[in-house]
Interface confidence: low
């Protein structure tokens, strides 16, 4: 009888990660008696993948009906392929020996290449908030893809960004790769609703790229503008002073009224109105009883926004311009800060 040959008909096999790889192998004879083993790699460091004789190979199934008496098909399926499974697989026939089986003949090998999808891109921004006109950096990371070729793009609100640097690691051959990119974005006052998008395109995604996003609302701080105005009220001896706090983000804001440098009232922004661009407006007012003051009053609206140093705006209230009313000892009343009650 002709000497046994081990035939591996496929020089290479390309499989997507998570799928099953079929590695084909047939023998031309049943003689000599002995098991087939599959190895990844050659030489002394080769890795046993399947042993027909014994062992536990939970990911491997045999292709042919294993109960056939004259089975010469030793093809296997390896389930749930990962990039770590890439390599050259050899089907090796052993002949039965004592005490150990003896390697008899090897197939030519089948190179298994694994196509692995990149993980969903994760975009992260700076740890601290920044104000408009500042440049901030965003990073995008995606891992576990193969082959190495990959395209990464950055967008801000649909507009492609050009100021970024990208690295794919490792540089040499590997079972899988990672991509890391850093983009620079200049903030504007209108960026509360803006998004930065990292888009990754890879052969495994069949033209449907993966996207990771970061909301600039988590990055931006828009400081408020303050305006203090005086409005007369019906009672001759009272003046309504308002502090308009405009175009701020985020909402965290504390306002303090000072009369001649002394704290009159402190309140926290609650009933705010939202602008179209995502920033907030708020108004606070102080009802000043002019008759309680002999001299002019310096009223200061002091705002601490999002833990930043306080900003303030002052207004000089001319007492001489108002008639005095005897017997009143109330300098100011807290009439609340809901602007719908003002007019």
């Amino acid at each position: 009888e002709e000497e046994l040959q081990v035939i591996q008909p496929d020089k290479s096999v390309l499989v997507a990660a998570g799928e099953t790889a079929t590695l084909r192998c047939t023998a031309t004879s049943l003689i000599p008696v002995g098991p087939i083993q599959w190895f990844r790699g050659a030489g002394p460091g080769r890795e046993l993948i399947y042993n027909q004789k014994e062992g536990h190979f939970p990911r491997v199934t045999t292709v042919s009906e294993s109960t056939k008496r004259k089975n010469m098909d030793f093809s296997i399926r390896i389930g749930n392929i990962t990039p770590a499974d890439a390599g050259t697989y050899y089907c090796v026939k052993f002949r039965k020996g004592s005490p150990d089986d003896v390697e008899f003949k090897s197939g030519a090998g089948t190179e298994l290449s694994v196509r692995a999808k990149p993980s969903a891109p994760v975009v992260s921004g700076p740890a601290a908030r920044a104000t408009p006109q500042h440049t901030v950096s965003f990073t995008c990371e995606s891992h576990g893809f193969s082959p190495r070729d990959i395209t990464l793009k950055w967008f801000k609100n649909g507009n492609e960004l050009s100021d970024f640097q990208t690295n794919v690691d490792p540089v040499g051959e590997s079972v899988s790769y990672s991509i890391h990119s850093t983009a620079k974005v200049v903030l504007t006052r209108e960026d509360v609703h803006s998004q930065v998008i990292c888009e990754v395109a890879h052969v495994t995604l069949q033209g449907d790229p993966l996207r990771g996003t970061a909301n600039l609302s988590e990055t931006i701080r828009v400081p408020p503008t303050l305006e203090v105005t005086q409005q007369p009220v019906r009672a001759e001896n009272q003046v309504n002073v308002t502090c308009q706090v405009r175009k701020f983000y985020p909402q965290r804001l504390q306002l303090t009224w000072l009369e001649n440098g002394n704290v009159s009232r402190t309140e926290t922004a609650s009933t705010v109105t939202e602008n179209k661009d995502g920033t907030y407006n708020w108004m606070s007012w102080l009802l000043v009883n002019v008759s309680a003051h002999r001299d002019d009053v310096k009223l200061t609206c002091q705002v601490e926004h999002d833990g930043q140093p306080a900003v303030s705006k002052s207004h000089d209230l001319k007492v001489s311009a108002h008639p005095k009313e005897q017997g009143s000892n109330t300098a100011a009343e807290n009439t609340g800060s809901n602007e719908r009650n003002i007019y």
Epitope: P35, K53, H56, P58, T61, S66, T67, R69, N80
Partner: antibody
Framework: QVQLVQSGAEVKKPGASVKVSCKAS????????ISWVRQAPGQGLEWMGW????????NYAQKLQGRVTMTTDTSTSTAYMELRSLRSDDTAVYYC?????????????WGRGTLVTVSS | DIQMTQSPSSVSASVGDRVTITCRAS??????LAWYQQKPGKAPKLLIY???NLQSGVPSRFSGSGSGTDFTLTISSLQPEDFATYYC?????????FGGGTKVEIK
């Protein structure tokens, strides 16, 4: 026909030994491992141990270590399970089962079982 | 040892019902779980191997799912011949262990 044929029922006294056989046919006996599984009356399945039909390598359940011996005879495609120092709680149906090719420790082929009764 | 906990221990159902049996491993076993059906006086029969693969000749109304520690056997439409006891079994490592069984009875 692919099958595992087991020996007949046994009645034993406490302290005695029993040897149950399991003859394989219809497939290459040495290509698979054999496990032994027992089932006490009205109870669930309990794995006793495994033997490679090719190499004779064994792995036994801890609680039976020292009392059980599993062997194979490739010339007759037969697996054997011997249990010594029998106790009343060894009364059970004893099954031999072949590991499937799909995953080494799944059992796709079972014998019909051998009832071993231990009673004084 | 890896403990296998099956629930419920019994379930009453009618022909046509959808029946779900769960099995939990005390530690991760990847997909190396099998499901068996056993009828009184008979040997167990392999239904599902590697958690979700249907054994040859088993009706497609049987399906398995899960990986790691939590697994499910589903009978989509119970047939008269399906009234039996079902066992899960981990094949990840020695010692091999079985669940306590779930008896599917006629309501």
């Amino acid at each position: 026909q692919v099958q595992l044929v087991q020996s007949g029922a046994e009645v034993k006294k406490p302290g005695a030994s029993v040897k149950v056989s399991c003859k394989a046919s219809g497939y290459t006996f040495h290509g698979y491992g054999i496990s032994w599984v027992r089932q006490a009356p009205g109870q669930g399945l309990e794995w006793m141990g495994w033997i490679s039909a090719y190499s004779g390598e064994t792995n036994y359940a801890q609680k039976l270590q020292g009392r059980v011996t599993m062997t194979t005879d490739t010339s007759t495609s037969t697996a054997y399970m011997e249990l010594r120092s029998l106790r009343s709680d060894d009364t059970a149906v004893y099954y031999c089962a072949r590991e499937a090719g799909s995953s080494w420790y799944d059992f796709d082929l079972w014998g019909r079982g051998t009832l071993v009764t231990v009673s004084s | 040892d890896i403990q296998m906990t099956q629930s419920p221990s019994s379930v009453s159902a009618s022909v046509g019902d959808r029946v779900t049996i769960t099995c939990r491993a005390s530690q991760g076993i990847s997909s190396w779980l099998a499901w068996y059906q056993q009828k009184p006086g008979k040997a167990p029969k392999l239904l599902i191997y590697a958690a979700s693969n249907l054994q040859s000749g088993v009706p497609s109304r049987f399906s398995g799912s899960g990986s790691g520690t939590d697994f499910t056997l589903t009978i989509s439409s119970l047939q008269p011949e399906d009234f039996a006891t079902y066992y899960c079994q981990q094949g990840a490592s020695f010692p091999i262990t079985f669940g306590g069984g779930t008896k599917v009875e006629i309501k």
